[in-house]
């Protein structure tokens, strides 16, 4: 009896693993083999493909074969026993196209209200991904064990950290890497679960800001708790985006390491052109908070990014507000050469109410004041492009008393 | 001011251990990365490995089987291990602080010319 | 391991001159890159780091510049002190890895 071709043959690769699978033809016939051979495009002759040959069971591995995963090859199997079928040949197919991105591998640390996430490839030096490595982005999905509701983060690096979390909780989530260069999304990793710590006595510092004053960055922040002393450590934000590279070393700020006050003053040549991540921490001499939330600090728009100047004239029942170019050390007005929006609050002096007003024009007018009264003003700008993102501190509060009533000019 | 001041055997046979340590005075020990890096006669630079107080060490690959680094918090030092050294291994080995305020060296040892001949 | 080539690998020069050597990274390492200057039987001294920030009590004569894979070292008017070998590093990630030097002789 001829024995048939083996049909429905099926090349699965994920990262470095090269798997065949197909279907037997004659299920009947027992004791049957299966071999395949390769061919390399511009080749005529077939090569034996090592690990696939005299095979019993419907899959083979050849991983060991050292392909060139840009270069087209074709696959042909046929049965054995006795006698051969004939060759069945697979579509052609370029290794690094078929190849799916295998579940990266996760580790996690937690905090009382974090959780800190270590994300690396699955296969370590692949030969698949290896002009691909340094583009690996990853997502996650991440939910309480209580809930089970999914909260999904996408395009995050090799270490990420989830902020905002519950104390004494149980987190799980899954990971799977992407390369969004040649439209590559992986496979999950397995599920991972983790307990937050118990909260912290001291809670990490919050609301961190950057400003810049004549030459120098000053960084502020809240914090809870009164006597505490506090530490500032910046990182090159493109560390953060090298893939399996434990170089991921926080470095000091020399004017922030023991400071007293919920802010330091320190040079602007401290950082050279770039972005960076800060953080901050806090100590009462026996406790260590956790670190802050990471900030991320772009010298190029935070060194021209300053608070605007404006000047108020006022009326009996409005305020006529002139947004002017903001001054650096010297008195010379600092060119913005990028389109800004103008956030302006405004408070009754004796009252917390505060009110708004986003406007793009530099001459804006805060209507329905009461006569007589002194009212306080702040404004800072954003920058409208949504890439940048960016927005100023708020200048300092300028405080002025309306005209008595019936004035209207 | 920082100082490392580095000592060790300078004439070894093929296959014996290479062993020099640092010790550093003058400055803290803790909160940064200490390196050892070696100079081949007439040649550049090749970084070996690093180490923190914790005693975590990263090492370059070229050299991870035969190399250890290890700190001893308590005299203020940290040592080097080459195991099975060749005439390859000929070379000024330097210990180096890896600076806290950003990413370089920052101080250097004096250099110790180490020469592996039969 | 990304590789740095330093060009030219020597280069003979008369005090006063301009000097501008390269160093090439077989990746982008951003602004992670590091020159230092390195006297014979002396270690290594800090000029450059973050690829344009001048080390502390380095003359201003000396300058960095670039980010990505190209960067130069720059001496805007050579010192008799200046005659020595330049190395760029990268601290990018691990290992890290040296450029194998330019050797600046007088001419």
């Known amino acids: 009896k001829n024995l048939k071709s083996p049909q429905k043959v099926e090349v699965d690769i994920i990262d470095d693993n090269f798997i065949l699978r197909w279907n037997r033809s004659d299920e009947s016939v027992g004791n049957v083999t299966f071999s395949f051979d390769y061919q390399k495009t511009g080749m005529d002759n077939w090569i034996k493909l090592s690990g696939c040959q005299n095979i019993t069971s419907t899959k083979c591995n050849f991983s060991s074969l050292k392909l060139n995963v840009y270069e087209e090859i074709k696959l042909r199997i046929r049965a054995e026993k006795e006698n051969t079928s004939s060759w069945y040949e697979v579509d052609s197919f370029t290794p690094f196209r078929k190849a799916q991105i295998g579940p990266p591998e996760v580790h996690l640390e937690a905090e009382d209200k974090a959780i800190v996430i270590h994300i690396s490839p699955g296969t370590k030096d692949s030969v698949m991904w290896a002009l691909d490595g340094l583009s690996f982005t990853y997502s996650l999905v991440i939910w309480k064990n209580s809930s089970g509701v999914e909260e999904r983060i996408e395009n995050i690096y090799s270490r990420h950290k989830i902020y905002k979390l519950s104390p004494e909780t149980t987190y799980c989530l899954k990971v799977k890497a992407a390369l969004l260069t040649s439209w590559k999304i992986g496979v999950y990793s397995p599920v991972h679960c983790i307990k937050t710590t118990v909260e912290n006595e001291l809670p990490p510092p919050e609301n961190i800001e950057v400003s810049v004053q004549n030459q120098n960055y000053v960084l502020k922040w809240d914090y809870t708790y009164a006597n505490m002393t506090f530490q500032v450590q910046w990182l090159h934000a493109f560390l953060k985006r090298n893939p399996g590279n434990h170089l991921y070393k926080w470095k000091q700020i020399p004017d922030c390491e023991n400071v007293k006050t919920t802010q330091c003053v320190f040079p602007q040549n401290v950082f050279q052109k770039g972005i960076y991540l800060l953080r901050v921490q806090a100590s009462d001499g026996n406790n260590t908070s956790f670190w802050s939330e990471e900030i991320k600090f772009d010298t190029e728009i935070q060194a021209f990014l300053l608070p605007p100047v404006f000047n108020i004239r006022s009326l009996s029942d409005s305020f006529h507000i002139y947004i002017g170019a903001p001054k650096q050390s010297g008195n010379t007005p600092v060119i913005q050469d990028y389109p800004l929006i103008y956030e302006i609050i405004f408070w009754e002096n004796t009252s917390n109410a505060e009110r708004k007003i986003i406007e793009k024009k530099t001459d804006v007018t805060v209507p329905n004041l009461k006569p007589l009264t002194v009212y306080c003003v702040k404004a800072r700008a954003h920058t409208m492009d949504e890439k940048l993102n960016k927005s100023s501190v708020f200048s300092d509060a300028v405080c002025e008393k309306t005209k008595p009533g019936n004035t209207s000019k | 001011q920082v100082q490392l001041q580095q000592w060790g055997a300078g004439l070894l046979k093929p296959s014996e251990t290479l062993s020099l340590t640092c010790a550093v005075y003058g400055g803290s020990f803790s909160n940064y990365y200490w390196s050892w890096i070696r100079q081949p006669p007439g040649k550049g630079l090749e970084w070996i490995g690093e180490?923190?107080?914790?005693?975590?060490?990263n090492y370059n690959p070229s050299l991870k089987s035969r190399v250890t680094i290890s700190v001893d918090t308590s005299k203020n030092q940290f040592s080097l291990n080459l195991t099975s050294v060749t005439a390859a291994d000929t070379a000024v080995y330097y210990c180096?602080?890896?600076?806290?305020?950003?990413?370089?060296?920052?101080?250097w040892g004096q250099g110790t010319l180490v020469t592996v001949s039969s | 391991a990304i590789q740095l080539t330093q060009s030219p690998s020597s280069l003979s020069a008369s005090v006063g001159d301009r000097v501008t050597i390269t160093c090439r990274a077989t990746q982008d390492i951003s602004i992670a890159l590091v020159w230092y200057q390195q006297k014979p039987g002396k270690a290594p001294e800090l000029l450059i780091y973050d690829a344009s920030g001048l080390g502390s009590g380095v003359p201003s004569r000396f300058s960095g510049s670039g980010s990505g894979t190209d960067f130069t070292l720059t001496i805007s008017s050579l010192q008799p002190e200046d005659f020595a070998t330049y190395y760029c590093?990268?601290?990018?990630?691990?290992?890290?890895?040296f450029g194998q030097g330019t050797k600046l002789e007088i001419k």
């Open positions: 590093q990268q601290f990018n990630s691990y290992p890290y890895t």
């Open positions: 180490i923190i107080l914790s005693g975590s060490t």
């Open positions: 180096a602080r890896e600076s806290k305020w950003g990413y370089y060296f920052d101080s």
